[in-house]
Each structure stands twice: as structure tokens, then as C-alpha cells.
């Protein structure tokens, strides 16, 4: 299994080499 998984599902996806920990990999961007 991977050594590091911060965001599950869409939060773990990377898009255009940008880490998606803030929701960039999700269809809807939701910040706190």
C-alpha cells in the first residue's frame, strides 16, 4: 500500500502536477 495517503478519494488526486490536498482533485472546490 502507499506510504502516504493524506486526502482520500478526490482529495488524493493530483491534477496538472498540483497537489490536491485543498480539493483541487474534487469536482467541487470546498475550502474552510
Amino acid at each position: 500500500s502507499p506510504k502516504m495517503v493524506q486526502g482520500s478519494g478526490c482529495f488524493g488526486r493530483k491534477m496538472d502536477r498540483i497537489s490536491s490536498s485543498s480539493g483541487l482533485g474534487c469536482k467541487v472546490l470546498r475550502r474552510h
Partner: antibody, heavy 117, light 111 residues
Framework: QIQLVQSGPELRKPGETVKISCKGS????????INWVKQTPRKDLKWMGW????????IYADDFKGRFAFSLETSANTAYLQINNLNNGDMGTYFC??????????WGQGTSVTVSS | DNVLTQSPPSLAVSLGQRATISCKAS??????????LNWYQQKPGQPPKFLIY???NLESGIPARFSGSGSGTDFNLNIHPVEEEDAATYYC?????????FGSGTKLEIK
């Protein structure tokens, strides 16, 4: 073995605050995000959001913005959920759960929150 | 939000027979060839247990009598042959979109 151990049941009055802890063991705590899930008295499961244990950044679902706060004490391998200004709708069982690439793989035992005047 | 509708709400299956639980999403949970659909088992007084991820992948330690299938919006969890210890409530969950959502659960009784 991998474990998430949560603090015990809580009884609070309306308007009060509760802080639930979730201690991870058996893995590198800062390598995996922690999600929070509420189970209502009707047994519905609601994802509240998650916190990045490496950066400390919290992400909240819309229904849990405002009175809810995720935090960390990484030196103690512990995540926290704080709920302010409690009301009857906050009653239920709260679970911390570890991020998996697709889902939520390890779960704490749950912390029951009762709100009663 | 992506609404997950599980059916039936409850079912009773004889020991050794097949249990099939359906989960239908209001929007596709597929992305880049993966289905972001997971299944959990919950017994009374316990937390949910991770069973199946990405629609059809068995989590480590889960018996092979559990299997998952489907893509897009329609998914199934199959248990065959059903054993006594499988009596529980089963939930599907999508992680393709924020907020993650769960189905309302299917309670499985063993006859």
C-alpha cells in the same frame, strides 16, 4: 497493529462545547489524513471533512462549517474534533477514520455525544 | 451532493445463499478509469469496517465470499455463501466528489 482510539462518551448541555480526541498508533500518524464521520441516532453516516496531518490544513463539508473545528497534536499522534455551541442536532456518535486512497480504512471505536438540559 | 440510494433497506437470506445489495448514485462516481465507490459493514456497537474499495477491490483480510461490481452510477455488493457472522448493516460510500456521501444502509438478517 493499526489503531485509532477515541475518548469516552460525552454528556453536555445545550450551548456548551465538546472536544473529542482520536489517537493513532501502529503507523506513521503524519502520513495519513484523518477524516471525521458523524452517525446520527437514525444510523445515517455523514462525512464531516478531514484534516491533513502533515500540513494541519482542515477541510470541512458544508454542513459542518462554523461550529466545528479539527485540530492536531502531532507530537502525541492525536487528532481532535471540537464542537461549539452544542444543540440537539449534534447528538450522535462521532468517528475518526484514516484516509485510504479510495475510502476510509481504519476507524476509531466512536464517541457518543448526548446533549441534554 | 451525490445521493446514494441503497436497496433493499433490509433483507433476510438463508445461510449459505447469496445476498445482493444495490447502490445507485445520482451522479457518476467514475474518474480516470476508477470507480470511487466503497462498501462498509457495521455491526451493532461497532464502527464501520472497510470491506471493498474502488467498486470491486477486496480490502486486506476480508473473506473472498464478499465481492463488489459495477461502474458509473450502478453498483452491487454480493455475499456468497452468506454466513451467520455476516448479519450486519452494509453502507456504500462515494469519494469521487466533495462532500463524500454514504448510502442509507441495508440491514442483512441471516435466516
Amino acid at each position: 497493529q493499526i489503531q485509532l482510539v477515541q475518548s469516552g462518551p460525552e454528556l453536555r448541555k445545550p450551548g456548551e462545547t465538546v472536544k473529542i480526541s482520536c489517537k493513532g498508533s501502529g503507523y506513521t500518524f503524519t502520513h495519513y489524513g484523518i477524516n471525521w464521520v458523524k452517525q446520527t441516532p437514525r444510523k445515517d453516516l455523514k462525512w464531516m471533512g478531514w484534516i491533513n496531518t502533515h500540513t494541519g490544513e482542515p477541510i470541512y463539508a458544508d454542513d459542518f462549517k462554523g461550529r466545528f473545528a479539527f485540530s492536531l497534536e502531532t507530537s502525541a499522534n492525536t487528532a481532535y474534533l471540537q464542537i461549539n455551541n452544542l444543540n440537539n442536532g449534534d447528538m450522535g456518535t462521532y468517528f475518526c477514520t484514516r484516509s485510504h486512497r479510495f475510502g476510509l480504512d481504519y476507524w476509531g471505536q466512536g464517541t457518543s455525544v448526548t446533549v441534554s438540559s | 451532493d451525490n445521493v446514494l440510494t441503497q436497496s433493499p433497506p433490509s433483507l433476510a437470506v438463508s445461510l449459505g445463499q447469496r445476498a445482493t445489495i444495490s447502490c445507485k448514485a445520482s451522479q457518476s462516481v467514475d474518474y480516470n478509469g476508477d470507480s470511487y465507490l466503497n462498501w462498509y459493514q457495521q455491526k451493532p456497537g461497532q464502527p464501520p469496517k472497510f470491506l471493498i474499495y474502488a467498486a470491486s477491490n477486496l480490502e486486506s483480510g476480508i473473506p473472498a465470499r464478499f465481492s463488489g461490481s459495477g461502474s458509473g452510477t450502478d453498483f452491487n455488493l454480493n455475499i456468497h455463501p452468506v454466513e451467520e457472522e455476516d448479519a450486519a448493516t452494509y453502507y456504500c460510500q462515494q469519494s469521487n466528489e466533495d462532500p463524500f456521501t454514504f448510502g442509507s444502509g441495508t440491514k442483512l438478517e441471516i435466516k
